[in-house]
């Protein structure tokens, strides 16, 4: 019997300072690009290695991003979302969305490869 | 994971035109940035011009600006690079690339390692 995967959601304001190659990571959505079903919220798809969110080390590859320096991102095209970023200035604040996964197996159940002791 | 294929390369006389094709697989292409970069030979492989995938914003290398442009066919998971007023100096292996996303940094500090997939790339050769 498999387990029930579930979600734990916590929010995090991470500030970044760009560097000269920038923020150093991508995103996807927008209302006008849907990356998660009926959800237009906007989400982090790469971070460059090296780069500003790298270094700092908090963002992660799938995070949502709330908001950017305080100015929402609900209800954003993408293209005025990446422009938002990129004209956001030196020092960068953003609220963000981690959503780790957290697998529950039933109870009193060990798997395979759980230690015995 | 995307497959790319460039196609459209050749000689042309210097101040000609060439319209390079990059065909991509996969279901989600309007998700990627697409560009594309030249290499000559010795030299290291530059960026020429990217194009985002939902509203389309482009961005280009200074020697190129007002001589190439790039677009793209959501419809058809093809973006071009139409190159008019050839120069010498743009002979090069010209390769196709996508990444996942729109990068949040602006196009004047793009390198190769800002794209994860390529193509085999297409020769240009202009005399």
């Known amino acids: 019997m498999n387990g029930r995967v579930d979600y734990l959601v916590t929010e995090e304001e991470i500030n970044l300072t760009r560097g000269p190659s920038g923020l150093g990571f991508n995103i996807v959505g927008g209302t006008d690009q849907q990356y998660v079903s009926n959800d237009s919220g906007i989400y982090v798809s790469r971070i460059k290695e090296n780069g500003a969110a790298a270094l700092d080390g908090r963002l992660q590859e799938g995070d949502k991003i709330l908001s950017v320096n305080g100015q929402d991102l609900k209800n954003l095209l993408h293209q005025d979302a990446v422009d938002l970023f990129r004209n956001a200035g030196y020092a960068v604040s953003l609220r963000v969305q981690h959503r780790l996964q957290v697998q529950n197996g039933p109870i009193g159940h060990r798997g395979e490869g759980d230690p015995s002791g | 994971q995307v497959q790319l294929v460039e196609s459209g390369g050749g000689l042309v006389q210097a101040g000609g035109s060439l319209r390079l094709s990059c065909s991509a697989s996969?279901?989600?292409?309007?998700?990627?940035?697409m560009g594309w970069f030249h290499q000559a030979p010795k030299k290291e492989r530059e960026f020429v011009a990217e194009?985002?995938?939902?509203?389309?914003?482009?961005g280009y290398t200074d020697s190129v600006k007002g001589r190439f442009t790039i677009s793209r066919d959501n419809a058809k998971n093809t973006v071009y690079l139409q190159m008019n007023s050839l120069k010498p100096e743009d002979t090069a292996v010209y390769y196709c690339?996508?990444?996942?996303?729109?990068?949040?940094?602006?196009?004047?500090?793009?390198?190769?390692?800002?794209?994860?997939?390529w193509g085999q790339g297409t020769q240009v050769t202009v005399s």
């Open positions: 996969g279901r989600t292409f309007s998700s990627y940035t």
């Open positions: 690339a996508a990444v996942i996303g729109s990068p949040t940094d602006s196009s004047d500090y793009r390198s190769s390692l800002d794209f994860d997939y």
């Open positions: 194009i985002g995938g939902t509203g389309g914003g482009t």
